[in-house]
């Protein structure tokens, strides 16, 4: 570093736990949503909706801000006629992504409030509430059974109602299919023309019963009891229906795939192609046999268009196919050979001909790198326009590709906008104009732009605010690295502090995810718990995606089938000794964590011995560990590790119980709420009883009838400065024990 | 694909009985509806009677009831349609259809058919 450099490094201030709350740091998404060929739907840091016209150039306010905050309402949604708003209010988390809600109706702009009902109840809690495609038709979900309504004013009328609250869910998901499957709380779908409505009914009856305990509040516990199947238990059962909307309510249900290897199988993924063909995704239980078929919602006969299968398991079942106008021709993405790194995801175009049962299908993409989503087709246009890592695995670029002729490909992001190679994208609805919304690695910004030359038409939202917040501090410098393992080359991420040099000792802190198929290393913008680690405590941080992370192959991905654990502690272990190659890394601060699957792996990595045999790490904390897969979900334990049941040894050979007995003097700190509706806390009482037995050194820290979120930004906090305080300890105890180490050798002089 | 076989059809006196039968094959699919119509030249189809396969819940039109009887032999993956007390306005094609479960027993939606038999009642 200059001196100048140094100088105005130390005006800056430290990033700190308050910093991460503050709204200086909080990063505003306006929530850009297109609602025609030329306008979209946004919402200012003030908190004003308005709609934008980019051809015109000129705003329109819908609702004010001040409207949404005497409403008290966390969501709001505009009727697709732009006449009425729906509000949500005392909004109460259940799971991840489901709520339930009081929400009321208001005409635009200034409206008085009108409670939304069903019929028979008054101020009813609903678990869900959205307009449908067409002028102001709605439905809502009331003790799991589908209400709709035709337009504002008219009476709400049941049109599902075998819903039995906690057993038999009607739109909705249960805990796995939210957690695991669908991945939202929303299994309903809309057809286009608003005629017809498609749900899932989710039977959980047979699935077993997990209490979840309240400690606090009452003289005596009490228990919420849910169904969450564990590895091997019954299944939730799941049919889709299509109800017609116009005229009596008609329901019908979609034939499932008759195939013996789909006798117990999850719906993954459902689109209306068009107003009476629905595209569904069939899996079977063992994850390695998908169907995707298209389903005619007048007779329920669904016809199979494409048939996957693996020798591990089957990724990414959630995506959705993109149709043309008539539904004969579209595009969805799936995993193709690519040589020696095995299969990359791309895109493949089925078309069919009008008198012809066979399809004809194409690749439009190829090459050692993934599409990660599909965005539009560009029908007139003859374009599809998507998101890669051609560029790099750790980037997101926007691209285009001719979807006739040679497939010629364009990148349309790259180089566009200043500190970003990290994009999410949407177009309007004639694919005119798009919104390109930047994660990374700068501070996330959102600009207008015309497809036809890529051209800004101008900023809708740069978080000025954050970037002056981030310029006054000391943020971690980020640097990039290959490591090579067993003909891999893996992605390494590291931080390190702003007034690095590399003649101090720095202790080192290793952060692990490696859920199969995530990706730790990416050029996204993040101010996180490790950034305060970094910047006000002096440490560097080191991220690795390993076997068994995604968007490198699928021969990368499916390396730790069955043997969860194994490689990804070989491979996090090479990363932590290519550090401890380098002269400012102090061997005796060397430090793990991770939550959840990154909470097994610090488990399992914590008592990892280095080259001379010496314990590698002086401590190591985990959040919410999985320490045994049979007690934790079967839709996700079952992809990895098979049907339990069948063969448990895979299962027997991941538990963290065979590694711990290894754990010496580390200080290893476990975290985890009582009320963890995920990974319940009986995973920690089981690793604590090994811990016990071991005669390990541990602490434990509980957040009394908590959820796996930690919904509450005061636990939140409470949560990181713990955290980072044990690590700060950690890294200081080791400056003790060198004094004192240093004081012996000299008496011993 | 889902086939279907309708046998038993035929000439009869009025107040005799048929029994019609109906072979499934080409589906392990256990949750059809399947259902009979018949048909009179230059009329519409009309619902005579549908069971669910899955539960053996039953539908009759108001004109057959307590004449006619639906059930089904699940080993022999069979539905049959016992007609008593058979009446001239009963002559017709009978058609054997499966569809997909639906809250309707009984509608036109069925995804598939069978050729159909001939019943004759002669006064």
């Known amino acids: 570093l200059t001196p100048a450099e140094d100088n105005s490094l130390s005006q800056k201030k430290k990033v700190t736990v308050e910093d991460l709350f503050s709204e200086d740091f909080k990063i505003h998404d306006p929530e850009a949503k297109w609602i025609s060929d030329t306008e979209f739907i946004y919402r200012e840091q003030k908190g004003t909706v308005r709609l934008w016209n980019v051809e015109t150039n000129t705003s329109t306010v819908l609702i004010e801000g001040k409207k949404i905050e005497s409403l008290r309402a966390i969501r709001y949604e505009i009727s697709p006629d732009r006449e009425y708003a729906l509000f949500s209010y005392n909004v109460e988390p259940i799971y991840q992504h489901s709520y339930t809600g009081y929400y009321v109706l208001s005409k635009i702009p200034h409206g008085d409030p009108q409670s939304l009902d069903p019929p028979e109840v008054s101020n009813a809690k609903l678990q869900y509430a959205g307009w449908g495609p067409k002028g102001q038709q709605l439905i809502f979900i009331f003790e799991n059974n589908i209400y709709y309504c035709a337009h504002v004013g008219k009476q709400a009328i049941r049109v599902v109602s075998t819903g039995k609250e906690g057993v038999i869910y009607n739109g909705l998901s249960d805990w796995l299919y939210e957690e695991e499957i669908l991945k939202t709380h929303i299994a309903h779908w809309w057809s286009p023309d608003g005629t017809r409505l498609a749900y899932a009914a989710i039977n959980d009856s047979r699935v077993p019963i997990m209490e979840l305990p309240t400690y606090t509040g009452s003289i005596y516990p009490t228990v919420k009891p849910y169904h969450y199947p564990k590895a091997g238990s019954e299944n939730p059962s799941i049919s889709l229906h299509v109800i017609g909307l116009n005229g009596p309510t008609h329901d019908l249900e979609m034939m499932p795939p008759d195939d013996p290897r789909m006798r117990e199988y999850y719906i993954t993924m459902v689109k209306w192609a068009t107003s009476t063909k629905v595209a569904v995704t069939w899996l079977n239980r063992a994850q390695n046999v998908s169907i995707l078929t298209l389903c005619d919602a007048t007779t329920g006969v669904c016809t199979k268009k494409h048939e996957d299968e693996s020798e591990a398991w089957l990724h990414r079942q959630n995506e959705e196919p993109v149709f043309s106008k008539d539904g004969r021709k579209f595009f969805f993405i799936r995993a193709i050979p690519q040589g020696g790194r095995g299969k990359f995801y791309h895109i493949t175009v089925s078309s069919s001909q009008p008198n012809s049962s066979n399809d004809n299908i194409q690749s439009i993409t190829s090459g050692d790198w993934d599409v990660t989503k599909i965005l539009a087709y560009d029908e007139k246009g003859n374009k599809i326009y998507f998101l890669s890592t051609e560029d790099l695995p750790r980037r997101r670029q926007l691209y285009s590709a001719n979807t006739v002729g040679n497939f010629n490909r364009q990148c349309l992001s790259c180089d566009l906008v200043e500190n970003c190679t990290y994009f999410s994208a949407s177009f309007s609805h004639s694919m005119d104009f798009f919104l390109l919304k930047c994660e990374g690695p700068g501070v996330p910004m959102v600009t207008v732009h015309n497809t036809t030359d890529k051209k800004k038409m101008f900023d809708l939202e740069t978080n000025e605010h954050v970037k002056k917040a981030i310029n006054d501090r000391q943020m971690p410098k980020v640097e990039y690295r290959d490591i090579e393992i067993d003909d891999y080359n893996l992605p390494m991420q590291i931080l390190k502090p702003a007034t690095f040099t590399d003649t101090t000792h720095y202790p080192l802190l290793l952060v692990v995810d490696g859920t199969p198929g995530s990706q730790s290393v990416a050029e996204k913008f993040e101010v996180s718990w490790e950034t305060v680690m970094v910047s006000s405590h002096g440490a560097v941080v080191v991220k690795c995606d390993g076997r068994g992370s995604g968007f490198q192959g699928t021969k990368l991905l499916h390396e730790v089938r069955r043997r969860l654990g194994l490689l990804e502690e070989k491979d996090q272990m090479e990363a932590v000794r290519t550090m401890l190659k380098e002269q400012y890394i102090d061997r005796t601060r060397v430090a793990v964590f991770g939550k959840d699957y990154g909470g097994y792996l610090s488990t399992y990595i914590l008592p990892a011995k280095g080259e001379n045999q010496g314990q590698t790490f002086t401590c190591g904390s985990a959040l919410s560990p999985i320490t045994d897969f049979k007690l934790y979900a079967s839709a996700f334990s079952e992809r990895y590790l098979g049907l339990h049941g069948l063969d448990n040894r895979a299962y027997e050979m991941t538990k963290v119980a065979h590694r711990v007995s290894a754990l010496e003097e580390q200080q290893f700190l476990i975290i985890h709420p009582t009320a963890d509706e995920k990974i319940h806390f009986q995973h920690t009482a089981e690793l604590i009883t090994q811990l016990i037995r071991g005669k390990a050194n541990y602490s434990l820290q509980i957040y009394p009838d908590e959820s796996h979120y930690f919904t509450s930004s005061s636990l939140k906090q409470h949560l990181y400065r713990s955290i980072i305080n044990f690590f700060v300890e950690c890294f200081r105890i080791q400056d003790k024990l060198l004094t004192v180490t240093a004081k012996e050798d000299e008496e011993e002089d | 694909q889902v086939q279907l076989q309708e046998s038993g059809g035929g000439s009869v006196q009025a107040g005799g009985s048929l029994r019609l039968s109906c072979a499934v094959s080409g589906s392990s699919y256990s949750r059809f509806r399947m259902g009979w119509f018949r048909q009179v030249p230059g009329k519409e189809r009309e619902g005579v009677a549908a069971?669910?396969?899955?539960?053996?819940?039953?539908y009759y039109a108001d004109s057959v009831k307590g004449r006619f009887t639906i059930s089904q032999d699940n080993t022999k993956n069979t539905v049959y349609l016992q007609m008593n007390s058979l009446k001239p306005e009963d002559t017709a094609m009978y058609y054997c259809?499966?569809?997909?479960?639906?809250?309707?027993?009984?509608?036109?939606?069925?995804?598939?058919w069978g050729q159909g038999t001939q019943v004759t009642v002669s006064s």
């Open positions: 259809a499966a569809g997909a479960y639906s809250s309707y027993l009984m509608d036109a939606n069925f995804a598939y």
């Open positions: 069971i669910y396969r899955s539960d053996g819940r039953t």
